[in-house]
Amino acid sequence: VKVLHEPSCFSDYISTSVCQWKMDHPTNCSAELRLSYQLDFMGSENHTCVPENREDSVCVCSMPIDDAVEADVYQLDLWAGQQLLWSGSFQPSKHVKPRTPGNLTVYPNISHTWLLMWTNPYPTENHLHSELTYMVNVSNDNDPEDFKVYNVTYMGPTLRLAASTLKSGASYSARVRAWAQTYNSTWSDWSPSTTWLNYYEPWEQH
């Protein structure tokens, strides 16, 4: 039993860290492997994560890690029975992958604009709430060449879009993802898409 690609881990910096790794052959992750994790200081409690298969030889483990602070470092040990396959350190604050923005909705707005709104995935008391910036991808459902990317660097989770910048009568889809610049995070996963028809009148809520 050998690890091909060692665990790569990311934290949402609120409640969960996820590690993924690849074995050198198809593996029943939950039956054969365990990932133990603990805060790296003397006397800290050891926890065990039962991995799941993402693919034949790819395992993923979701670990509840609450109240992360910048200095926290976790010790990870990957076991196959009594055999230690791999060990390493993981600092959640250095490997942040934000939660996915939610509830992306498109509203008609004044002056022939569309108002795209979504929810910040973090509560106001969390460090990341005020750190997120967003990328919005707007694409024509019938023309792969017709797409636009908008960077939302202000705090509000909204984007105003002039209807005239989109083809009239075309169906468009939008999705949004987030990142936290000060944490040098990776991008979050994309939100589910929301679709609307770009027309000029009458204006109705979608």
């Epitope: 603990q38 200081f41 396959l85 791999w86 060990s87 350190s89």
Partner: antibody, heavy 124, light 107 residues
Framework: EVTLVESGGGLVQPGGSLKLSCAAS????????MYWVRQTPEKRLEWVAY????????YYPDTIKGRFTISRDNAKNTLYLQMSRLKSEDTAMYYC?????????????????WGQGTLVTVSA | DIQMTQSPASLSASVGETVTITCRAS??????LAWYQQKQGKSPQLLVY???TLAEGVPARFSGSGSGTQFSLKINSLQPEDFGSYYC?????????FGAGTKLELK
């Protein structure tokens, strides 16, 4: 400049105990896994123990487990090896070594820095 | 545990010659292999890690190659300071293990 200086070696009877120390300087000690490696009189190199950067995790080969304890004091930049129930086959030069990269993983367990070693002789 | 087998156990060479030391792992260790040099009465010194990456300050006449189970360390144009013992060590997981060493002597 990275330096590792071991001390505490000496002659000890079988079944006895000894505590080795390693004073580290020239790098952020608390960022690194640290290891003890020994070299037998026949010049074979053997890994003895490792400890994680924060000291929360330790690991030993089966020949060592239950007899030796690795620990660290990050405030004092010092690594320790408490050896008990010593056997004649534990006779060796004991080296303190530093992991290749800060934090990192077991795949970074190559040793760019070694101390000068401290000799442990177990004999009646 | 992964066994590391080094060959030859010893060899004699002259200054200016090129020599190659080999190391075989009992199972696939990808490229996770380090080489060390040890001179009489001194601590080992890292030469190569990750199979072929030269450690800081190591002269370019040293080169590491190989992956999987077969590895080699080549020393071009031997210099007087190159004589001593050489050890390989895998760093693919726990426990790390070392080869028994190759003693390089002046002919």
């Amino acid at each position: 400049e990275v330096t590792l200086v071991e001390s505490g070696g000496g002659l000890v009877q079988p079944g006895g105990s000894l505590k080795l120390s390693c004073a580290a300087s020239g790098f952020t000690f608390s960022d690194y896994y640290m290891y003890w490696v020994r070299q037998t009189p026949e010049k074979r190199l053997e890994w003895v123990a490792y400890i994680s950067p924060g000291g929360g995790s330790t690991y030993y080969p089966d020949t060592i487990k239950g007899r030796f304890t690795i620990s660290r004091d990050n405030a004092k930049n010092t690594l320790y090896l408490q050896m008990s129930r010593l056997k004649s086959e534990d006779t060796a030069m004991y080296y303190c070594t530093r992991h290749g990269s800060p934090y990192g993983s077991s795949r970074g367990a190559w040793f760019a820095y070694w101390g000068q070693g401290t000799l442990v002789t177990v004999s009646a | 545990d992964i066994q590391m087998t080094q060959s030859p156990a010893s060899l004699s060479a002259s200054v200016g010659e090129t020599v190659t030391i080999t190391c075989r792992a009992s199972e696939n260790i990808y490229s996770y292999l380090a080489w060390y040099q040890q001179k009489q009465g001194k601590s080992p010194q890292l030469l190569v890690y990750n199979g072929k990456t030269l450690a800081e300050g190591v002269p370019a006449r040293f080169s590491g190659s190989g992956s999987g189970t077969q590895f080699s360390l080549k020393i071009n144009s031997l210099q007087p300071e190159d004589f001593g013992s050489y050890y390989c060590q895998h760093h693919d997981g726990i426990p790390v293990t070392f080869g028994a060493g190759t003693k390089l002597e002046l002919k």
